[in-house]
């Protein structure tokens, strides 16, 4: 079933979540779907501490996260509230830039080479990070 008490093989545990770091690139939608089929979601960054953890593992490489505004407002893929939540945009970002010549603006968020966030064309083949939460029941310390 989907109830998890420990991370799958090749996933990294951190603060009761499990993370998987890709080494290839996909468009945002394909990365999003890849995570779903692993019973996970594209990483949702909720704190500076989580930001630093992810940044440490991905290095200076453009990497998709689970944040997009394809339907208007910015949304995290797991429903975490964007407006009140953690943000780490680069200065002047997001800018929904249309000057790339690829059609449309920029609707998907990624970590840049310095870890701060940028919005970019969702079709770009960037690396990605999947995240899945461990169950609350498994967070309780064992009875002695």
């Amino acid at each position: 079933g989907s109830e998890r008490t420990c991370c799958p093989v090749n996933w990294v545990e951190h603060e009761r979540s499990c993370y998987w770091f890709s080494r290839s690139g996909k468009a945002w939608a394909d990365a999003d779907n890849y995570c779903r089929l692993e019973d996970a979601h594209l990483v949702v960054v909720t704190s500076w501490e989580e930001q630093k953890f992810v940044q440490h593992h991905i290095g200076p490489v453009n990497t998709w996260m689970g944040l997009h505004d394809q339907n208007g407002p910015w949304k995290w893929v797991d429903g975490t509230d964007y407006e009140t939540g953690f943000k780490n945009w680069r200065p002047e970002q997001p800018d929904d830039w249309y000057g790339h010549g690829l059609g449309g603006g920029e609707d998907c968020a990624h970590f840049t080479d310095d870890g701060r966030w940028n919005d970019d064309v969702c079709q770009r083949p960037y690396r990605w990070v999947c995240e899945t939460e461990l169950d609350k029941a498994s967070q309780e310390p064992p009875l002695l």
């Epitope: 989907s2 109830e3 779903r36 019973d39 893929v77 797991d78 169950d135």
Partner: antibody, heavy 121, light 107 residues
């Protein structure tokens, strides 16, 4: 034992609204995505919508997008389908189905008995 | 969207026969395919997922194979209780589309 019990079906006029409910028991409801799947009389299965375990993300078939809204109340172990602007072609038995994953693998290991929705004037 | 087709739409076979149902996706879906059995007047039951993994409690006479666009459900020795409609379903991405079904009965 996993149990899914749908309710809320009935006769409604075209353009009308209906809210279906699915009461779940026998498993940790919030740990699983859920879907609604319909079956018109004498026809095959048609997936309508899905919602992930924490309720934070939804998926819809094009045929219901903008008309139907899936939601859940994990404190009540209940799944909902709000159906607006109903059409004759929405007439079907509506099943709620339990996904095998939290973030919606998209296939279903338990199904309710279904509730019949009839759209007719 | 990806379309799912099944063949045949119906078949009759004798008890003990080997029965094969095929499912085809209009585009590749890797092995993200499930099979369901729906007996008359009953709710669907999951038989197989990831194309070939048998769901717990499903008799071993059922098996699945295939990848990409072409998939097969096989009943190695048809039993009277296997009279049902069988549906394939793709779940590689939403929408999670079902095939039109194959009705199986006994000669």
């Amino acid at each position: 034992e996993v149990q899914l019990l749908e309710s809320g079906g009935g006769l409604v006029q075209p353009g009308g609204s209906l809210r279906l409910s699915c009461a779940a028991s026998g498993f940790t409801f919030s740990s699983y995505a859920m879907s609604w799947v319909r079956q018109a009389p004498g026809k095959g299965l048609e997936w309508d919508s899905a919602i992930i375990g924490n309720g934070g993300r939804t998926y819809y078939a094009d045929s219901v997008k903008g008309r139907f809204t899936i939601s859940r109340d994990n404190s009540k172990n209940t799944l909902y389908l709000q159906m607006n602007s109903l059409r004759a072609e929405d007439t079907a038995v509506y099943y709620c189905a339990k996904d095998m994953g939290r973030y919606s693998y998209g296939f279903f290991d338990y199904w309710g008995q279904g509730t019949l929705v009839t759209v007719s004037s | 969207d990806i379309q799912m087709t099944q063949s045949p739409s119906s078949l009759s076979a004798s008890v003990g026969d080997r029965v094969t149902i095929t499912c085809r996706a209009s585009q590749g879906i890797s092995n993200y395919l499930a099979w369901y059995q729906q007996k008359p007047g009953k709710v669907p039951k999951l038989l197989i997922y990831v194309a070939s993994t048998l769901q717990s409690g499903v008799p071993s006479r059922f098996s699945g194979s295939g990848s990409g666009t072409d998939f097969t459900l096989t009943i190695s020795s048809l039993q009277p209780e296997d009279v049902a409609t069988y549906y394939c379903q793709k779940y590689n991405s939403a929408p999670f589309t079902f095939g039109p079904g194959t009705k199986v009965d006994i000669k």
